[in-house]
């Protein structure tokens, strides 16, 4: 399986909400002995590998933001802790999973990574990740809504997140 990032760049005005999205692609084994661990974290564009370093998102670690379930099941993070920080991660039945960040500030700008760990027979692991950049802007040059740039081409889409 692979992880796709529909958008590689999100440009948002301060105060807006945004939902960053990743999608699980390819054959997903829904067997009894296969589970998926999904999470989010901030990182940096490393010289060797992007998303290698795991930094917190608004003081919440990847441990706080994880989802753990089988196949294409729906799931949400524990609401209380994440929502106090204006965050929520979620997963649907179609392999999409996301993190929503509310009331963006300039400090939220940076590289965000989604991580999927496929666990087979409870201990054999396969890891994949996706990366996307969030730019939070302020002032007269800031867009009125979030503008997202698809990963494949640089045509922008205006969205109200």
């Amino acid at each position: 399986f692979k992880v796709a990032t529909p958008y590689s760049l999100y440009v948002c005005p301060e105060g807006q909400n945004v939902t960053l999205t990743c999608r699980l692609l390819g054959p997903v084994d829904k067997g009894h002995d296969v589970t998926f661990y999904k999470t989010w974290y901030r990182s940096s564009r490393g010289e060797v590998q992007t998303c290698s370093e795991r930094r917190p998102i608004r003081n919440l670690t990847f441990q706080d933001l994880h989802l753990h379930h089988g196949g294409h099941q729906a799931a949400n993070t524990s609401h209380d802790l994440a929502q106090r920080h204006g965050l929520e991660s979620a997963s649907d039945h179609h392999g999409n999973f996301s993190i929503t960040m509310r009331n963006l500030t300039l400090l939220d700008s940076g590289l965000y990574c989604c991580l999927v760990v496929e666990i087979r027979h409870h201990h054999s692991e396969h890891r994949v990740h996706g990366a996307m950049e969030l730019q939070v802007q302020t002032g007269k040059d800031a867009p009125s809504n979030c503008v997202v740039y698809p990963s494949s081409s640089q045509e922008s889409e205006n969205i109200t997140a």
Partner: antibody
Framework: QVQLVESGGGLVKPGGSLRLSCAAS????????MYWIRQAPGKGLEWVSY????????YYADSVKGRFTISRDNAKNSLYLQMNSLRAEDTAVYYC???????????WGRGTLVTVSS | EIVLTQSPATLSLSPGERATLSCRAS??????LAWYQQKPGQAPRLLIY???NRATGIPARFSASGSGTDFTLTISSLEPEDFAVYYC?????????FGQGTKVEIK
């Protein structure tokens, strides 16, 4: 405070039994895979047993298979290791440690000493 | 199971010197390797994850590199509190295994 605290170690004769406990606090215990890892005096680290976050499945090192039983009670935030038919070579400090998929042992207890001697 | 071999077994150095520790795997572990520090009477502490990333709160004098079968932990300038035993551990294959440790002692 995020911590793991082991208890239940002590001196026991060969063939005897002990039950170790590990109390977790400050984090969502039911999210984590848990391990018992031991360290014989002056030696390195050796994993003993593993239990998934839900309590199943369970794995044991060959050296303890059939003699040790790992279990957990997520409602009590506790991990256990029942050790039977103890041998001199089981003498070690026993640590509990937490783990997540694609991650490492980022939290350990301070350990409890098990001495098997006649 | 994957065997991790650490060298040297003991490293005798003075404070301020550079320490270079090695960990070699019997087969590739990709970048799924961690380093731990253990001081006498204490539990191990995670220093480095995924071969080269410092865990939370670990000083910048600790750095690490490598992938596949050969890995290195470097302490750029030894502080008194760095004298300890260092272990590598892999999670690419089951079971999770540790190296036998390298003791960094005061010369």
């Amino acid at each position: 405070q995020v911590q793991l605290v082991e208890s239940g170690g002590g001196l026991v004769k060969p063939g005897g039994s002990l039950r170790l406990s590990c109390a977790a606090s400050g984090f969502t215990f039911s999210d984590y895979y848990m391990y018992w890892i031991r360290q014989a005096p002056g030696k390195g680290l050796e994993w003993v047993s593993y239990i998934s976050n839900s309590g199943s499945p369970i794995y044991y090192a060959d050296s303890v298979k059939g003699r040790f039983t790992i279990s957990r009670d997520n409602a009590k935030n506790s991990l256990y290791l029942q050790m039977n038919s103890l041998r001199a070579e089981d003498t070690a400090v026993y640590y509990c440690a937490r783990d997540l998929p694609g991650w490492y042992f980022d939290l350990w207890g301070r350990g409890t000493l098990v001495t098997v001697s006649s | 199971e994957i065997v991790l071999t650490q060298s040297p077994a003991t490293l005798s150095l003075s404070p301020g010197e550079r320490a270079t520790l090695s960990c070699r795997a019997s087969q590739s572990v990709s970048s799924y390797l961690a380093w731990y520090q253990q001081k006498p009477g204490q539990a191990p502490r995670l220093l480095i994850y995924d071969a080269s990333n410092r865990a939370t709160g670990i000083p910048a004098r600790f750095s690490a590199s490598g992938s596949g079968t050969d890995f290195t932990l470097t302490i750029s300038s030894l502080e008194p509190e760095d004298f300890a035993v260092y272990y590598c551990q892999q999670r690419n294959n089951w079971p999770r295994t540790f190296g036998q440790g390298t003791k960094v002692e005061i010369k």
